[in-house]
Amino acid sequence: GITQSPKYLFRKEGQNVTLSCEQNLNHDAMYWYRQDPGQGLRLIYYSQIVNDFQKGDIAEGYSVSREKKESFPLTVTSAQKNPTAFYLCASSI
């Protein structure tokens, strides 16, 4: 399956925080989305192979890495001034 953690996270002002996303489905592609109240999902970053990733529609204030196939952590950087949202990780073949 696919596992995202933590379930809840509080960020101190000026801090970077990292959200974990791990999958054991042997999927090549992984995605991070953000959902704000009353809105649809918006793509932050996506990755289609190891060590390659592309910006989505709202990449500003976020960073990612794809060091291995199974993992695609998202860092919410201190530059992200409005981080409060629901974050969703997904994967696909």
Epitope: Q48, I49, N51, D52, E67, K68
Partner: antibody
Framework: QVQLQESGPGLVKPSETLSLTCTVS?????????WNWIRQFPGKGLEWMGY???????NYNPSLKSRITISRDTSKNQFSLKLSSVTAADTAVYYC?????????????WGCGTTVTVSS | DIQMTQSPSSLSASVGDRVTITCRSS???????????LHWYQQKPGCAPKLLIY???NRFSGVPSRFSGSGSGTDFTLTISSLQPEDFATYYC?????????FGQGTKLEIK
Amino acid sequence: QVQLQESGPGLVKPSETLSLTCTVSGYSITSGYFWNWIRQFPGKGLEWMGYISYDGSNNYNPSLKSRITISRDTSKNQFSLKLSSVTAADTAVYYCASPSPGTGYAVDYWGCGTTVTVSS
Amino acid sequence: DIQMTQSPSSLSASVGDRVTITCRSSQSLVHSNRNTYLHWYQQKPGCAPKLLIYKVSNRFSGVPSRFSGSGSGTDFTLTISSLQPEDFATYYCSQSTHVPFTFGQGTKLEIK
């Protein structure tokens, strides 16, 4: 910052096995990425030989597949190249290399290179 | 294997010149994920190659803006807009879309 350093004999006799080791510092080879061997012939042509992945899986150049083995020693954070049945055509500078983050498979962390001469 | 053919194989130019090196692959370098893994390296004598451009047109960290890459499919170019003394070196294209990864034969850029 990832640093790589090749080591091994500079002279190998024809028909013998070439053995080189790459020591990695600044990053664990089990944490991610692909750990490559690339060689450069005296005429300056570059050839990708193969890699070992963070999970221990291999991908080899088919032109070398019957002769090449890339393995790793995770306790020493090293990966190694063995090339059997060498001839003078295997004389080259051998580099270990790994990709820079986010570049696909484009390598930009390189060892200094070690010159291997095949001669009796 | 994918053959990578660079032209010219050598080139003489002067400081300030605009220089273009071309690289042609024997088949398309578009990956099934729609990215194109074509890269450019610079090598100086006694040194390992250095990454200049990755994925056709992305300048690697610290690479001056006078270097640019373009192209698609099978035809690619590296352009140096205004040659500097430190740019005289050998340039290689490389593809990592298909295994085995392959390199062009190199273009040696010399001072005129």
